[in-house]
């Protein structure tokens, strides 16, 4: 039995997969910031995790996926205000009792040092200095990502 948040995440990813190709993104769109091979958009408004997930989807992007600690640090370096939290694409899967990225993969426990509980209705946010577990209903900012690629590419759940 999937939670409403897990179902929402799956539905959005599936709807995005129906488009099998899109032109490769050569440059980051206006207001997006380039970080290596990604474009990141830091919202100014606040939303619960579900709405943030949906907002990134309408922008043909996804909530931020972080590959490793190095990428986390570089992303945090782009956050200008100390106290502000941003949702990323990681939430607690009740059915699998583990942190799960919105592309379906599980968190490698060495990647992020999460402050807070791993429990139902918990989603992950990052600040300039830390990674936090928050209630998914909390209204905070969020980060969308688009992959930069110079060629026509298939759209996969983690793209």
């Amino acid at each position: 039995q999937k939670s409403s948040i897990e179902k929402c995440s799956v539905d959005i990813q599936q709807s995005r997969n129906k488009t099998t190709e899109r032109p490769g993104l050569l440059n980051c769109p206006i207001y997006w910031q380039q970080l290596r091979e990604k474009c990141l958009l830091f919202s100014h408004t606040v939303n619960p995790w579900n709405n943030s997930l949906a907002d990134c989807s309408t922008k043909e992007s996804s909530l931020l996926l972080i590959r490793d600690k190095d990428e986390l640090i570089h992303t945090q370096n782009l956050i200008r205000d100390k106290a502000i939290l941003f949702w990323i694409g990681l939430n607690f899967s009740l059915s699998e009792k583990n942190w799960k990225w919105i592309n379906g993969s599980f968190l490698n426990s060495n990647d992020l040092e999460i402050r807070g509980d791993a429990k139902e209705n918990s989603c992950i946010s990052i600040s300039q200095t830390s990674v936090y577990s928050e209630y998914c209903s909390t209204e905070i900012r969020w980060i969308c990502q688009k992959e930069l690629t110079p060629v026509r590419n298939k759209v996969y759940p983690d793209s």
Epitope: H44, T45, K59
Partner: antibody
Framework: QVQLQESGPGLVKPSETLSLTCTVS????????WSWIRQPAGKGLEWIGR???????NKNPSLKSRITMSEDRSKNQFSLKLSSVTAADTAVYYC???????????WGQGTLVIVSS | QSALTQPPSASGSPGQSVTISCTGT?????????VSWYQQHPGKAPKFMIY???ERPSGVPDRFSGSKSGNTASLTVSGLQAEDEADYYC??????????FGGGTKLTVL
Amino acid sequence: QVQLQESGPGLVKPSETLSLTCTVSGGSISSYYWSWIRQPAGKGLEWIGRIYTSGSTNKNPSLKSRITMSEDRSKNQFSLKLSSVTAADTAVYYCARDPLGSFFDYWGQGTLVIVSS
Amino acid sequence: QSALTQPPSASGSPGQSVTISCTGTSSDVGGYNYVSWYQQHPGKAPKFMIYEVSERPSGVPDRFSGSKSGNTASLTVSGLQAEDEADYYCSSYAGSNNVVFGGGTKLTVL
């Protein structure tokens, strides 16, 4: 180049509902937020509210109970309804693109709405 | 939420610099780096000039610059030109997904 065009009645009777539509050309309404802003003659700007393309909205607390916003992606349009209008709602109404939720980079030319019987 | 406070008028001669202030509170200007500025000529729609306190969109001359200290943001127009004569409005994110504008400043080029 993104262009926005407001349309709707220029005259509305007191207690009735003001209805405006903004048509966006030169780009899709998806991927951005869209706001309504108004300006009474000789006065400053007032933010009315915004709509996300996911359909959710944010509204100015002072107008919240009277505002309805919607969008029609197939027509590349978004709309504002302001109910129970009074003479104080007479203003030039602008629609604007609201990229991140705190500033407005493209504006319509504005449409004057007069509330009078 | 109250309007941000701007001086009603400002003036300067061609070539001079003029600074327009925009004062808010810790709940808007002071609390976020999300201040923007707009230029409005009579009978026209506002034009986007500055965002995120000091970022300038493409096409806006570098004579226009923005800054912030505490609860007060400022727009500086250097090398004043006749076409800079207009009304200028600041705005700020004000928490809870709201935006608030200043009352506007009429800039006169003497």
